[in-house]
């Protein structure tokens, strides 16, 4: 037996009181740009590595962390003045004396050519067009990643419309 | 617009004392690391000393080491030397520079003040 | 510290000649080099970084090359507002950062 009209209408201007949950999006917050799979913050201060670790993690996000070439070019191409580099999340380790990322793992020989020194207190940053190692006390812009989210939109039915 | 004003030069004697400021405006001046650069009449250039963005980090030329102070106050977007002890030898346009942001301590000088004349003498 | 030796100390040329000035390094400093115009009464000017980097702003007629310990700065078409003195400055990361004796160029 089919519902009556009546009946189907009371059922929609009592849902119009609640709120429907839209499809899982996958979001970025608010001033953070979407890369691919991440959410990238570009600090507008400067700081020493070690403090720019420290603003990410109150974030809720890390210093950014480079998979391969592709990604370098890809983040590369969103830093618009070639005067102006960022701090990442790969320092020297010196008991191991090697790249480290700060997920633990090392930088393989092929991801990215690095030029400076590999040293203690050697940290990396980017610029549009090349990767350098520096003074871990040096102050300079950041770039913080989160992993894009998944985000329950809960909106009124109203505001499809 | 972006730029950087000295002011405090003058005629000094030997031994005397001497403080110059360097108003910057049109940026963000916080964001930088900050030189004082010099130049004898008919001379080439010296750079003399450097500030961090913070403060937190200061390096001098040795001949000034001990005897100058540099330092900065990013809530009045200046930056200060003050001179001590002068010597004849540190007669000179005294520049503040701004570094490109992009190298860290690699310091090159991509905004320059006009300067202002330091002369030391009896 | 690192000494820059700069060649030649001056050098006289005409509007549209082709002008290279080169700095020598007393020790390797990678690509940490730049160039910088002063005019008489004037502040310098950065016309180059990193060796090869054309500051923003800058003419394209001006470019620069080298690595290590050698580098020139090229002009390949001199103008009339190029008749300046220019200088070479070292910038590796630790202090003192210093300056090439300056090349004067004049007009023949």
């Known amino acids: 037996q089919k519902p009556s009209i009546g009946k189907c209408s009371v059922d929609i201007q009592q849902n119009r009181t609640k709120t429907t949950e839209r499809p899982d999006l996958l979001n970025c917050p608010i001033y953070w740009q979407q890369v691919q799979e991440k959410c990238l913050l570009f600090s507008h201060t400067v700081n020493p590595w070690n403090n720019s670790l420290a603003d990410c993690s109150t974030k809720e996000s890390s210093l950014l962390l480079i998979q391969d070439k592709d990604e370098l070019t890809r983040t590369q191409n969103l830093i618009h003045d070639k005067a102006i580099s960022f701090w990442i999340g790969l320092n020297f380790s010196l008991s191991e004396k090697n790249w480290k990322w700060i997920n633990g793992s090392f930088l393989s020989s092929n991801d990215l050519k690095i030029t400076g020194d590999a040293k203690e207190n050697s940290c990396v940053y980017i610029s549009q067009t090349s990767v350098y190692s520096e003074y871990c006390s040096t102050e300079m812009k950041w770039i913080c990643q989160k992993e894009l989210t998944l985000v329950r939109n809960k909106v009124s039915p109203d505001s499809w419309l | 617009q972006v730029q950087l004003v000295e002011s405090g030069g003058g005629l000094v004697k030997p031994g005397g004392s001497l403080r110059l400021s360097c108003a910057a405006s049109g940026f963000t001046f916080a964001n930088y690391y900050m030189s004082w650069i010099r130049q004898a009449p008919g001379k080439g250039l010296e750079w003399v000393s450097y500030i961090s963005p913070s403060g937190a980090t200061i390096a001098y030329a040795d001949s000034v080491k001990g005897r100058f102070t540099i330092s900065r106050d990013n809530a009045k977007n200046s930056l200060y030397l003050q001179m001590n002890s002068l010597r004849a030898e540190d007669t000179a346009v005294y520049y503040c520079a701004r570094s490109l942001m992009a190298t860290g301590t690699h310091l090159y000088f991509d905004l320059w003040g006009r300067g202002t004349l330091v002369t030391v003498s009896s | 510290d690192i000494q820059l030796t700069q060649s030649p100390s001056s050098v006289s040329a005409s509007v549209g000649d082709r002008v290279t000035i080169t700095c020598r390094a007393s020790s390797g400093i990678s690509s940490w080099l730049a160039w910088y115009q002063q005019k008489p009464g004037k502040a310098p000017k950065l016309l180059i970084y990193?060796?090869?980097e054309l500051q923003s702003g800058v003419p394209s007629r001006f470019s620069g090359s080298g690595s290590g310990t050698d580098f020139t700065l090229t002009i390949s078409s001199l103008q009339p507002e190029d008749f300046a003195t220019y200088y070479c400055q070292q910038a590796t990361s630790f202090p003192p950062y210093t300056f090439g004796g300056g090349t004067k160029v004049e007009i023949k």
């Open positions: 990193a060796a090869s």
